[in-house]
Interface confidence: low
């Protein structure tokens, strides 16, 4: 069946050296551990993270991107997704897309991480 | 169906200016970076400039760096390069490529013919 | 710049033949290396991205493989349709860069 795939619709912020998480999910929401789920950064396609046959799939994995990330799959079956990127760097700035791949069937949202300056960040307010 | 149609191209003199377009259906365009790739006549391919789905990352080759620049409308499903200093060298068919995991859709191209 | 070098920069073979064109990276670049077919007057079409993994709707004949510099695209058994030139292009680092075209012609 067809969905769409459903990303943070602002920016989201991070400090250097922080985690940062990037949610993703179906909609209609359904089971997706069967599905191919994984994030890249536009527009080299540099792949940060892939869920395939059911496990990680740490070898096709960007090298600046190894030992960084976790997918959090607690909610998978939902169609709930979330990418966990640990130690962010100012170089992690920029366009993340997730996409789930049902079989032939793909699509992807777009997000955007913004990482700032610990030293110089304000909060809003 | 995904689709990808360019316009904008034509005969411009050295040191013109050209702007491309190109029109996006078949797919949620603002979900995608793209790209804008060119052959010279009976040459091979050579990346130009992509942008990220946001517009907030563009990347350029050497060749065109401070000449072009790549801009994108979500609202309109429209991908723009603009092409200022036209030199010789720049002619060319330019495609308009949309981004998956490598250049997975082209346009037909629109052919840049720059001549005195 | 990574430099991208296909082998050969042309063949003939015949309908039915096994063919296999080469590129090789001036520098390893992963998994990170696409092919595409193009013909005549057309826009390229991607045939296998990632190294090996087959586009939707390219028919199995096409396949590839290789990692880190050294990559193959092999059509197993040539069909009429598929004369045409193919690139291979890396996406591992900016500027992606592509092969110079190997042209596949009839015997």
């Known amino acids: 069946g067809q969905f769409r795939v459903i990303g943070p619709r602002h920016p989201i912020r991070a400090l250097v050296g922080d985690e940062v998480e990037l949610p993703c999910r179906i909609s209609p929401g359904k089971n997706a551990t069967g599905m191919e789920v994984g994030w890249y950064r536009p527009p080299f396609s540099r792949v940060v993270h892939l869920y395939r046959n059911g496990k990680d799939q740490d070898g096709d994995q960007a090298p600046e991107y190894r030992g960084r990330t976790e997918l959090l799959k607690d909610a998978i079956g939902e169609g709930k997704v979330t990418l966990r990127i640990r130690n962010v760097r100012f170089s992690d700035e920029g366009g993340f897309t997730c996409f789930f791949r049902d079989h032939s069937y793909q699509e992807e949202a777009a997000m955007e991480l913004k990482v700032e300056d610990p030293f110089y960040w304000v909060s809003p307010g | 169906e995904v689709q990808l149609l360019e316009s904008g191209g034509g005969l411009v003199q050295p040191g013109g200016s050209l702007r491309l377009s190109c029109a996006a259906s078949g797919f949620t365009f603002s979900s995608y970076a793209m790209s804008w790739v060119r052959q010279a006549p009976g040459k091979g391919l050579e990346w130009v400039s992509s942008?990220?789905?946001?517009?907030?990352?563009?990347g350029y080759a050497d060749s065109v760096k401070g000449r072009f620049t790549i801009s994108r409308d979500n609202s309109k499903n429209t991908l723009y390069l603009q092409m200022n200093s036209l030199r010789a060298e720049d002619t060319a068919v330019y495609y308009c490529?949309?981004?998956?995991?490598?250049?997975?859709?082209w346009g037909q191209g629109t052919l840049v013919t720059v001549s005195s | 710049d990574i430099q991208m070098t296909q082998s050969p920069s042309s063949l003939s073979a015949s309908v039915g033949d096994r063919v296999t064109i080469t590129c090789r990276a001036s520098?390893?670049?992963?998994?990170?290396l696409n092919w595409y077919q193009q013909k005549p007057g057309k826009a390229p079409k991607l045939l296998i991205y990632?190294?090996?993994a087959l586009q939707s709707g390219v028919p199995s004949r096409f396949s590839g493989s290789g990692s880190g510099t050294d990559f193959t695209l092999t059509i197993s058994s040539l069909q009429p349709e598929d004369f045409a030139t193919y690139y291979c292009q890396q996406n591992d680092a900016s500027p992606n860069t592509f092969g110079q075209g190997t042209k596949v012609e009839i015997k």
């Open positions: 990632g190294a090996s």
């Open positions: 942008i990220s789905s946001y517009g907030s990352y563009t």
């Open positions: 490529a949309k981004n998956g995991y490598a250049f997975d859709y």
């Open positions: 520098q390893s670049i992963s998994s990170y």
